[in-house]
């Protein structure tokens, strides 16, 4: 379901990644250097920036982030 409009609810932050608010709604997500072999599964639809550098992701399927706007 859709997230309620609120100033006190946190956007989804994937496990082990570091997240930083980007304005009122959006989230910058840093998942760099975590040894990931695939994309994090629980990315917020409000993700404005995603850093996947220094990981072991060898290939991406077509449209790998369908939930992102």
């Amino acid at each position: 379901g859709s997230s309620p409009r609120s100033g006190v609810l946190l956007r989804g932050c994937p496990t082990h990644c570091h997240c930083e608010p980007d304005g009122r709604m959006l989230l910058r997500v840093d998942c760099s250097d975590l040894g990931l072999s695939e994309l994090p599964s629980n990315l917020s639809v409000f993700t404005s920036y995603l850093d996947l550098s220094m990981n072991n992701i060898s290939q991406l399927l077509p449209n790998p982030l369908p939930s992102l706007r």
Epitope: S6, V8, L9, L10, R11, G12, C19
Partner: antibody
Framework: QVQLVQSGAEVKKPGASVKVSCKAS????????MQWVRQAPGQGLEWIGE????????NYNQKFQGRVTLTVDTSTSTAYMELSSLRSEDTAVYYC??????????WGQGTTVTVSS | EIVMTQSPATLSLSPGERATLSCRAS??????LNWYQQKPGQAVRLLIS???RRHTGIPARFSGSGSGTDYTLTISSLEPEDFAVYYC?????????FGGGTKLEIK
């Protein structure tokens, strides 16, 4: 610098209402939500509700629904919390606090509300 | 509503020691956790948001970790000014709820 200055201590009788004010300065008032949290003597923190000053959209803790009203006056950058039908259990320190993307980064100094007959 | 349980209620340590404060949620909160510090007569202070993000001006000795329902605030080497009450707060669903607090006192 960001400041949230709250009104002074209040002593009220059971059944009465109290209105606490919170004057904000040092930032753009309508860009941040205002949270209201209370702390009973010797207890932890309890969320009352929140208001978005840009359009007065509110969320309330169901525990207080019907007894609490949050409002803002954008011309003076002031937020208000009114709690009605007061009972002794409402004796607490009431805090306003500003939030943005899910966390509260600045808190007021607190307003002590004492409910006693 | 989600119930947040902190342990221990009181932690007695000496300056220079490592402090580990625990917070458990009654259901998965997907890393949506904040930590706050409260000292008598002072405004509440945000330490950590999003489980591990230190707020502006918070020293590196404070760190947050955890996932699912279990989260930890660690203070690597206690300074005299760190003795206070610490609260965790979930930001996963309304109403946001706080733990009962952990009082960190000087041994």
């Amino acid at each position: 610098q960001v400041q949230l200055v709250q009104s002074g201590a209040e002593v009220k009788k059971p059944g009465a209402s109290v209105k606490v004010s919170c004057k904000a300065s040092g930032y753009t008032f309508t860009n941040y939500w205002m949270q209201w949290v209370r702390q009973a003597p010797g207890q932890g923190l309890e969320w009352i509700g929140e208001i978005d000053p840009s359009d007065s959209y509110t969320n309330y803790n169901q525990k207080f629904q019907g007894r609490v009203t949050l409002t803002v006056d954008t011309s003076t950058s002031t937020a208000y919390m009114e709690l009605s039908s007061l009972r002794s259990e409402d004796t607490a320190v009431y805090y306003c606090a500003r939030s943005l993307s899910g966390y509260v980064d600045y808190w007021g100094q607190g307003t002590t509300v004492t409910v006693s007959s | 509503e989600i119930v947040m349980t902190q342990s221990p209620a009181t932690l007695s340590l000496s300056p220079g020691e490592r402090a580990t404060l625990s917070c458990r949620a009654s259901q998965d909160i997907s890393n949506r956790l904040n930590w706050y510090q409260q000292k008598p007569g002072q405004a509440v202070r945000l330490l950590i948001s999003y489980r591990s993000r230190r707020h502006t001006g918070i020293p590196a000795r404070f760190s947050g970790s955890g996932s699912g329902t279990d989260y930890t605030l660690t203070i690597s080497s206690l300074e005299p000014e760190d003795f206070a009450v610490y609260y965790c707060q979930q930001g996963n669903s309304l109403p946001p709820t706080f733990g009962g607090g952990t009082k960190l006192e000087i041994k």
